[in-house]
Amino acid sequence: MMTGTIETTGNISAEKGGSIILQCHLSSTTAQVTQVNWEQQDQLLAICNADLGWHISPSFKDRVAPGPGLGLTLQSLTVNDTGEYFCIYHTYPDGTYTGRIFLEVLESSVAEHGARFQIP
């Protein structure tokens, strides 16, 4: 029986050209984590494996950095980075847990404009 839950950073926005940290946290399970995958839609961004460490997909090597922890840092953001990101925890004996994050990358002026109007 799968008892674990994944907490994610949820829906987040960031400025074009900036960076963002994607984070997921698996809790409420004693299952052993063996690997964590980070994916964007159907593209693999990175893997953190218990025995092999981190692997960053070659096409993202210049813009993706592992960490902090099991999170992933996306750098030099473009509007094309807008979309769904998934953290996939492979565990034993539970199986797979998946968390979803939606990232919206905003044009600089739009992000600044939005921030101004969030201040009470």
């Epitope: 004693t30 063996t34 953190c48 960053i56 922890g69």
Partner: antibody, heavy 117, light 107 residues
Framework: QVQLQQPGSELVRPGASVKLSCKAS????????MHWVKQRHGQGLEWIGN????????NYDEKFKNKGTLTVDTSSSTAYMHLSSLTSEDSAVYYC??????????WGQGTTLTVSS | DIVLTQSPATLSVTPGDSVSLSCRAS??????LHWFQQKSHESPRLLIN???QSMSGIPSRFRGSGSGTDFTLSINSLETEDFGMYFC?????????FGGGTKLEIK
Amino acid sequence: QVQLQQPGSELVRPGASVKLSCKASGYTFTSYWMHWVKQRHGQGLEWIGNIFPGSGITNYDEKFKNKGTLTVDTSSSTAYMHLSSLTSEDSAVYYCAREGLYAFDYWGQGTTLTVSS
Amino acid sequence: DIVLTQSPATLSVTPGDSVSLSCRASQSIRNSLHWFQQKSHESPRLLINYASQSMSGIPSRFRGSGSGTDFTLSINSLETEDFGMYFCQQTNSWPYTFGGGTKLEIK
């Protein structure tokens, strides 16, 4: 098996610099973060910073930004920490530690740095 | 920076006793909290990662719990080899930080 080898001790003069080493073996050096941690006189642990050998990315605690510089030599699977303008406050045990899926799972034995004239 | 506060600073107990060590974070770190044991003149050893995951080879008497800001390391039926320093550490955000430690000593 995973090993992080550090020299046992270093003795340096005040005002001088030192380059501490941490030689990794038993795993793919470029796939794990390497961290450096300071411990004075058997007291608490202080995180200095980290480096990802696969890309050379570094992070530092603000307190150590002007004190330490982290580098790696991937050909020899060795991590280095260069400490400058040494004072007695820098006398401590310095550990390197690997971070992977299970956090700081392997540590070096530590190098005891003594700054004395 | 995230501050980790460990309590008590020192705990004097007898072998066979059970103890709970506390680590409190200045802000939520979800479950990115790890526990280390350090004996005199030795390197720290990872006991528990991500709040509750026991490392391979660690005796079952060590158990980690908590999330958010409050975490506990429980040790059931202490053995003489368990005495030493215990540190918590967060890896939720850089800079990573350690707690000040709890010294577990024989009464």
